[in-house]
């Protein structure tokens, strides 16, 4: 029997009866918050073999082992995870061992076993036999191994029953409890599972099977389950569902889950029955069960109940994330903020259509409107008094509307209004009239030529670069000396530069009036000699990196109320020279015969140019005499060389730390002080623990139903 869509057992241990007939839990299993210690011995669920999502145990008093509850749990698929984990055992006060002796596979996700004060038999389980990667496992704050004295079956009688594997250079017996070994399949099975009698299962089986080489005898399926058989792919007219089984179209059409109730039903896409079309696809019609690719970003219509959405902070902008069509009016009123331009672009950058009007007022933090980088149509279905559908008033630092060379914006109905934007040149407004098709709609007072652009250098001359020289981490550039009508109006130059992998940057990218700017700025004074061209050496740059550079002349902006000319260059793209690459990463070598070594590595993190080849050098070294000191035919444990790793696990240190041998002298001395890196790592670790605990509490503490 398949049970689903996730089972939450809390408060009352008798709710466990809900698991009675389950063979597969399609979803998660939570067992938590049972504060009264109970006797769980009468509860046993031998039918349960698979959990498709994750298993979470939290604060269950009196439960000492999971082995009696779930003796045949074989696979946790991890199709959906709990904070990256497929198995979470947290604050289980009485748990003494995990005991899931039939658990053979956790298909996806890691494990988190934390704050279980009495929990032992953790170091005796080889998780690498169950999980693909053990590096993300988090096993912390449990009973210290020294206090556990874990013994695998038969060890005391000197008739060990369990097999050995190596973990962290420790070659040891592997078991779940004092009487349950960890099952390992013969090497002849390779990646395949095996029966209790060590016969290899069918390749489509996962975890275990009741008969060898039979795809109908699997305990769980490696790929998909359909009509009693494990199959590599779902047969025609059936679709993958929840990552483990095949269902028909009717089943998919009829799913009504709590998670999907607001949607238009499940869809069939790419052979899978899923809750929504994946990223980049949209339903082929509102009630369709099929998906088609979106042209450009997928449309998402957002509507404001009160008709007008006020954007006065990043928080209010956040509500528009992903929206492509905004039904209503936008009122933008950003007076201050941190990194505001890029934040607004992140949340409003996909908006293509506004059905009503757009009003920007008192937005002193804005330098440009380029954060609305996809806006192409203002319908003007609703207009401000005076029939305005684009209204820009009193924005003290607004300098650019959009980059009109790369922007096509149409205002379908309504007029534009601009007033009291002292840094916005009227030429920029006139250009907008042309592009948006509003030329001729505005009356004389709608674009105020006196108080727009009054504090800007509006009629710009072009500065021309005269030379560029590059090295691996420097760029030297010079440009023509700019000569305004009155030389006293020229104060200095400002050079702007930044990394630009692509030639698509604009002057106002990431810039706002509150100090955030994606450009680096350097001031360049005028050369005292009038015949010397101004220039600069930009240093500390990265090798083989393309930079965008432009220069602006800093001029006095007003001369007796007349606009004066300013000057700036075009954006120049220039690449630094190549340099020596950083070292190749993760070098591994292994011998696959008596005369061969296989060496593998990853590319360097900083190639600093186009890598064309690697040089591999090797040399013969004398044999280590250490290898001859041990009789490898003896039954004793093979000695392991331990290398100090320079870190101390705080939780494990119980004796006086003043026992280390330091500086080559015999005798006690103090533990070395922690390095900054170690302190930082500890801080991050503590932070990570807090984040997980918060996530756990937020996920599981819910209001009591009814």
């Amino acid at each position: 029997e398949i049970c689903g869509p996730g089972i939450d057992i809390r408060n009352d241990y008798q709710q466990l009866k809900r698991l009675e007939n389950c063979t597969v839990i399609e979803g998660y299993l939570h067992i938590l918050l049972i504060s009264k210690a109970e006797d769980y011995r009468s509860y046993r669920f031998p039918k349960l073999t698979v959990i498709t999502e994750y298993l979470l145990l939290f604060r269950v008093a009196g439960l000492e082992s999971l082995g009696d509850l779930f003796p045949n749990l074989t696979v946790i698929r991890g199709w959906k995870l709990f904070y990256n984990y497929a198995l979470v055992i947290f604050e289980m006060t009485n748990l003494k061992d995990i005991g899931l002796y039939n658990l053979r596979n956790i298909t996806r996700g890691a494990i988190r076993i934390e704050k279980n004060a009495d929990l032992c038999y953790l170091s005796t389980v080889d998780w690498s036999l169950i999980l693909d990667a053990v590096s993300n496992n988090y096993i912390v704050g449990n009973k210290p191994p020294k206090e556990c004295g874990d013994l695998c079956p038969g060890t005391m009688e000197e008739k060990p029953m369990c097999e050995k594997t190596t973990i962290n250079n420790e070659y040891n017996y592997r078991c779940w409890t004092t009487n349950r070994c960890q099952k390992m399949c013969p090497s002849t099975c390779g990646k395949r599972a095996c029966t209790e009698n060590n016969e290899c299962c069918h390749p489509e089986c996962l975890g275990s099977c009741s008969a060898p080489d039979n795809d109908t005898a699997c305990v769980a399926c490696r790929h998909y389950y359909y009509a009693g058989v494990c199959v590599p792919a779902c047969p025609p007219n059936t679709y993958r569902f929840e990552g483990w089984r095949c269902v028909d179209r009717d089943f998919c059409a009829n799913i009504l889950s709590a998670e999907s109730s607001d949607s238009e039903g499940f869809v069939i896409h790419d052979g899978e029955c899923m809750q929504e079309c994946p990223s980049g696809f949209i339903r082929n019609g509102s009630q369709s069960m099929y998906c088609i690719p979106c042209e450009g970003p997928c449309p998402k219509v957002c509507e404001e109940e009160k008709k007008t959405k006020t954007i006065d902070s990043v928080t209010s902008a956040q509500m528009l994330q992903g929206c492509t069509i905004f039904k209503g009016n936008l009122l933008i009123n950003i007076r201050r903020g941190n990194n505001i331009a890029s934040e607004l672009e992140n949340f409003m950058g996909l908006i293509e259509v506004v059905t009503g009007y757009v009003k920007i007022r008192h937005s002193h933090a804005l330098v440009s409107l380029s954060f609305l980088k996809n806006l192409r149509l203002i319908l003007g279905e609703e207009q401000l008094e005076g029939n305005y559908s684009f209204y820009v008033l009193d924005n003290q630092n607004l300098q650019q509307l959009w980059d009109w060379d790369h922007r096509n914006l149409t205002i379908k109905a309504g007029k534009m209004y601009f007033a009291f934007n002292p840094k916005l040149c009227v030429s920029e407004i006139y250009r907008m009239e042309e592009v948006t098709g509003t030329k001729g709609r505005q009356s004389k007072g709608d674009i105020n030529t006196r108080n727009n652009g009054e504090r800007a250098s509006c009629e710009s001359d072009v500065l021309h670069f005269t030379s560029t020289t590059t090295s691996k981490n420097r760029i030297i550039i010079t440009w023509h000396r700019y000569r305004p009508p009155d030389y006293r109006d020229l104060i200095s130059f400002t050079v702007y530069y930044k990394e630009a992998p692509f030639k698509n940057v604009t002057e106002y990218d990431g810039q706002d009036a509150c100090g955030s700017n994606s450009w680096n700025m350097v001031d360049v004074d005028l050369p005292p000699n009038k015949d010397v061209e101004p220039g600069i050496l930009l240093h500390g740059l990265k090798p083989w990196t393309q930079y965008a550079v432009y220069v602006k002349a800093v001029t006095l902006t007003m001369v007796e109320n007349d606009h004066i000319r300013g000057a700036k260059s075009e954006i120049l793209y220039i690449r630094t020279n190549a340099s020596v690459p950083s070292i190749p990463l993760d070098v591994l070598s292994a011998s696959n015969s008596s005369s061969q070594l296989i060496v593998k590595w990853n590319p360097p993190s900083l190639p600093n140019g186009n890598l064309s080849y690697y040089i591999v050098r090797w040399q013969r070294q004398p044999q280590d005499g250490y290898l001859y000191r041990h009789n490898y035919c003896s039954k004793d444990k093979i000695p392991i060389r331990k290398y100090a790793d320079g870190t101390i696990d705080i939780e494990e240190v119980t004796e006086n730390p003043k026992t280390e041998v330091c500086g080559g002298e015999k005798g006690p001395c103090c533990a070395c002080p922690k390095t900054e890196a170690e302190k930082q790592a500890e801080k991050e670790e503590a932070e990570y623990r807090k984040v997980f605990e918060n996530f756990l509490h937020n996920s599981i503490f819910v209001p009591r139903p009814e």
Partner: antibody
Framework: QVQLQESGPGLVKPSETLSLTCTVS?????????WNWIRQPPGKGLEWIGY???????NYKPSLKDRVTISRDTSKNQFSLKLSSVTAADTAVYYC??????????WGQGTLVTVSS | DIVMTQSPLSLPVTPGEPASISCRSS???????????LQWYLQKPGQSPQLLIY???NRLYGVPDRFSGSGSGTDFTLKISRVEAEDVGVYYC?????????FGQGTKVEIK
């Protein structure tokens, strides 16, 4: 496989309250779907009584609304029907059934309730 | 309430011959989302009803292709191209587009 099983007294006296329980196995009633009661008087057609939604809301047939209550016990994964002030006209086979987005996909086997003194 | 009226109420058939049942609703059963939630169920003697057709014309996976559904708005039809002995029972149409949901009164199909 989802299974629904009706249970309750087979005989109810007139003017009393008919109480039935539907025990669901294989699917959590809070996880999704609409959990329905349908009845069929002997030799007659099917009549929808109402449903209890996974989110706790109910919908009833207007002509029965004043007499009917559908509730749930999430800890036992059960939902129940209470029909008050019964008469002989309420004698029927009572079915519980699960409805998804489009159709009834699972039905109980039905339980006969006779209203008689 | 929307009234679903089936005809005929009784349909004697010869195995191998076609059969047709009509279902008419007292008002349109097109849902606001554009779908028409009309289903056909078969109740065999002593059993619970079982689904044959959903959303007017979608045959449930595993239902023989001799069963087909059609119609729109207020008029709907279930056709059996060649009746077989196992098809006997009472056929109900059902609308789930508007609450209260309603069944037709049923059509009894029996072998002549």
């Amino acid at each position: 496989q989802v299974q629904l099983q009706e249970s309750g007294p087979g005989l109810v006296k007139p003017s009393e309250t008919l109480s039935l329980t539907c025990t669901v196995s294989g699917y959590s009633i809070t996880g999704g779907y609409l959990w329905n009661w349908i009845r069929q008087p002997p030799g007659k057609g099917l009549e929808w009584i109402g449903y209890h939604s996974y989110d706790g809301t109910n919908n009833y047939k207007p002509s029965l609304k004043d007499r009917v209550t559908i509730s749930r016990d999430t800890s036992k994964n059960q939902f129940s029907l209470k029909l008050s002030s019964v008469t002989a006209a309420d004698t029927a086979v009572y079915y519980c059934a699960r409805y998804g987005r489009v159709f009834f996909d699972y039905w109980g086997q039905g339980t006969l309730v006779t209203v008689s003194s | 309430d929307i009234v679903m009226t089936q005809s005929p109420l009784s349909l004697p058939v010869t195995p191998g011959e076609p059969a047709s049942i009509s279902c008419r609703s007292s008002q349109s059963i097109v849902h606001s989302n554009g779908n028409t939630y009309l289903q056909w169920y078969l109740q065999k003697p002593g059993q619970s009803p079982q689904l044959l057709i959903y959303k007017v014309s979608n045959r449930l996976y595993g239902v023989p292709d001799r069963f087909s559904g059609s119609g729109s708005g207020t008029d709907f039809t279930l056709k059996i191209s060649r009746v077989e002995a196992e098809d006997v029972g009472v056929y109900y149409c059902f609308q789930g587009s508007h609450v209260p949901w309603t069944f037709g009164q049923g059509t009894k199909v029996e072998i002549k």
